[in-house]
């Protein structure tokens, strides 16, 4: 048997081209110079290499760059990026948004993989904060990206970046995340007029405190029930029947359909039945007339 480690005569690759697709895996390993591969990475994507052949090429790059690939190579990885492990990616130092975009493009249409999550993490940490351009890029590829971050990570998002956020980007955010994002959104949109402000702030309201909801109720915003149902329960409870009526406007009728669900259910339990009756919706479960309501939390605070 011929020892298959040395490149056969006449097979040494002079450039990365189509002729390589019919090289055996061991021939690719023996005949393709890793430095040549690194400088011509952009050509790899145009050549229909098999999955196995791509592994050989990756192995050559790994041997050439044991400490991690330089950005000049990373930017042109193309489909070879799909072969990288999170451990590989942790060795990288990606600073260019163009590089990030190029790699996200490769994974487009698929769910966020561990590789992509690691890449984004490395990129954002390298930048120090989640700036507007980065957020624009990430939410364009992954609408749920923002909601995948921890509240701690979200705290590094500058208010200016909030302009890039679309309502669908917040669909999977939980209250803890909205608690962090809401004050940033409020700051970002503070110079807008009433109706425009409400359109922009609406998807962040799951993090709004009671006083902001009270203020909104004075502005004829006509909040829809879907938004109301996402509000923090502790923020809704102190609202009066009149305030909720103003906040919802014509949508107030929707309370009946939601009376068994939070936060409506809990809010009803805190209202006087007399006040609820004024809505004419047949909401039941309020405090009967003649009962005295003691706010124990207030009493504790005073003592």
């Amino acid at each position: 048997e011929v020892e298959k480690t040395a490149c056969p005569s006449g097979k040494k690759a002079r450039e990365i081209d189509e002729s390589l697709i019919f090289y055996k895996k061991w021939e690719l390993e023996a005949c393709v110079d890793a430095a040549l591969l690194a400088t011509q990475m952009d050509r790899v994507n145009a050549i229909p290499f098999t999955y196995e052949q791509l592994d050989v090429l990756k192995h050559k790059l790994d041997e050439l760059y044991p400490q991690g690939y330089p950005e000049s190579v990373i930017q042109h990885l193309g489909y070879l990026f799909l072969k990288m492990s999170p451990e590989d990616i942790r060795k990288w130092n990606v600073t260019s948004l163009e590089t990030l975009k190029a790699l996200l493009e490769v994974n487009k249409g698929h769910e966020m993989s561990p590789q992509v999550a690691t890449l984004i993490d490395r990129f954002v940490k390298g930048r120090g904060q989640l700036d507007k351009d980065t957020l624009d890029t990430l939410t364009a590829f992954y609408p749920g990206y923002l909601c995948s971050l921890s509240p701690e990570e979200l705290s590094s998002v500058p208010p200016s970046s909030i302009w890039a956020v679309r309502p669908q980007d917040l669909d999977t955010c939980d209250p803890r995340q909205l608690d962090v994002l809401y004050p940033k959104a409020r700051l970002a949109f503070q110079n807008m007029n009433g109706s425009e402000y409400f359109v922009k702030i609406q998807s962040f309201l799951g993090g709004a405190p009671t006083e902001d909801l009270k203020a909104l109720s004075q502005q004829n915003v006509s909040m829809d029930l879907a938004t109301f149902m996402k509000l923090r329960t502790d923020a809704v409870l102190p609202l009066t029947v009149a305030e909720v009526q103003k906040l919802l406007g014509p949508h107030v009728e929707g309370l009946k359909a939601e009376e068994r669900h939070r936060p409506v259910r809990d809010w009803i339990l805190r209202q006087r039945q007399d006040d609820l009756d004024t809505l004419g919706l047949g909401l039941q479960g309020g405090i009967p007339n003649g009962y005295l309501v003691l706010d124990l939390s207030m009493q504790e605070a005073l003592s």
Epitope: K25, W26, E29, E52
Partner: antibody
């Protein structure tokens, strides 16, 4: 003289798991690819997958997810982990070496082990 | 997905006959093809690689030809020990394929 000996076969219930081993001698796993092939009674050869010298694994489309190939170079042993076994997985399981010292499956399988029988039934 | 089709599935022949077995790939695989011989109760035996190169110790009556999609295994003069099942195998792409082996051709005594 290169030798391959499979072990770990036997009877297993549907839904169960089994790990087959292939002990090799006469060559190094860091220089050769190793594959697994099975053959149901009276049927043809069916490729399961292989592991290259550098540890990258490749599988038949039907085997992905249920079957896992691994190796321990220091123990000169290759493994086939089989999960969620079904009656149709009943077969003789062969391990085989890549014939080429290039370390990938480039030329074919040679030599082969004698095989180990796996029966899946309740 | 890359598939291998072998024909015929079985054939009967006499000692001394010339036997030809065909293997077709669903796409071009260059010369990345191997042939095996298998007898009942035994593991396969490696016969040919690179479509036409004889493996070590294989008698010269066995030969292989073809490139691209169509391949042939020929036994020039069938011997008693050649009655067996023959399989082709593509080694061009071994990832995520249904099977790298052909369906097999059983050669029996006429």
């Amino acid at each position: 003289q290169s030798q391959l000996v499979e072990s770990g076969g036997g009877r297993v219930q549907p839904g169960g798991s089994l790990r087959l081993s292939c002990a090799v001698s006469g060559f190094s796993l860091s220089s050769y690819a190793m594959g697994w092939v099975r053959q149901a009674p009276g049927k043809g050869l069916e490729y399961i997958g292989y592991i290259s010298k550098i540890g990258t694994t490749y599988y038949a489309s039907w085997a992905k997810g249920r079957f896992t190939i691994s190796k321990d170079n220091s123990k000169n042993t290759v493994y086939l982990q089989m999960n969620s076994l079904r009656a149709e997985d009943t077969a003789t399981y062969f391990c085989a070496r890549g014939s080429s010292s290039g370390g990938y499956l480039d030329d074919g399988f040679d030599p082969w082990g004698q095989g180990t029988q796996v029966t899946v039934s309740s | 997905a890359l598939q291998m089709t072998q024909s015929p599935s079985s054939l009967s022949a006499r000692v001394g006959d010339r036997v030809t077995i065909k293997c077709q790939a669903s796409q071009s695989i260059s010369n990345y093809l191997a042939w095996y011989q298998q007898k009942p109760g035994k593991p396969p035996k490696f016969l040919i690689y690179d479509a036409s190169d004889l493996a070590s110790g294989v008698p010269s009556r066995f030969s292989g030809s073809g490139s691209g999609r169509d391949f042939t295994l020929t036994i020039s003069s069938l011997q008693p020990e050649d009655f067996a099942t023959y399989y082709c195998q593509q080694v061009y792409d071994s990832n995520n394929v249904e099977n790298v082996f052909g369906t097999g051709t059983k050669v029996t005594v006429l």
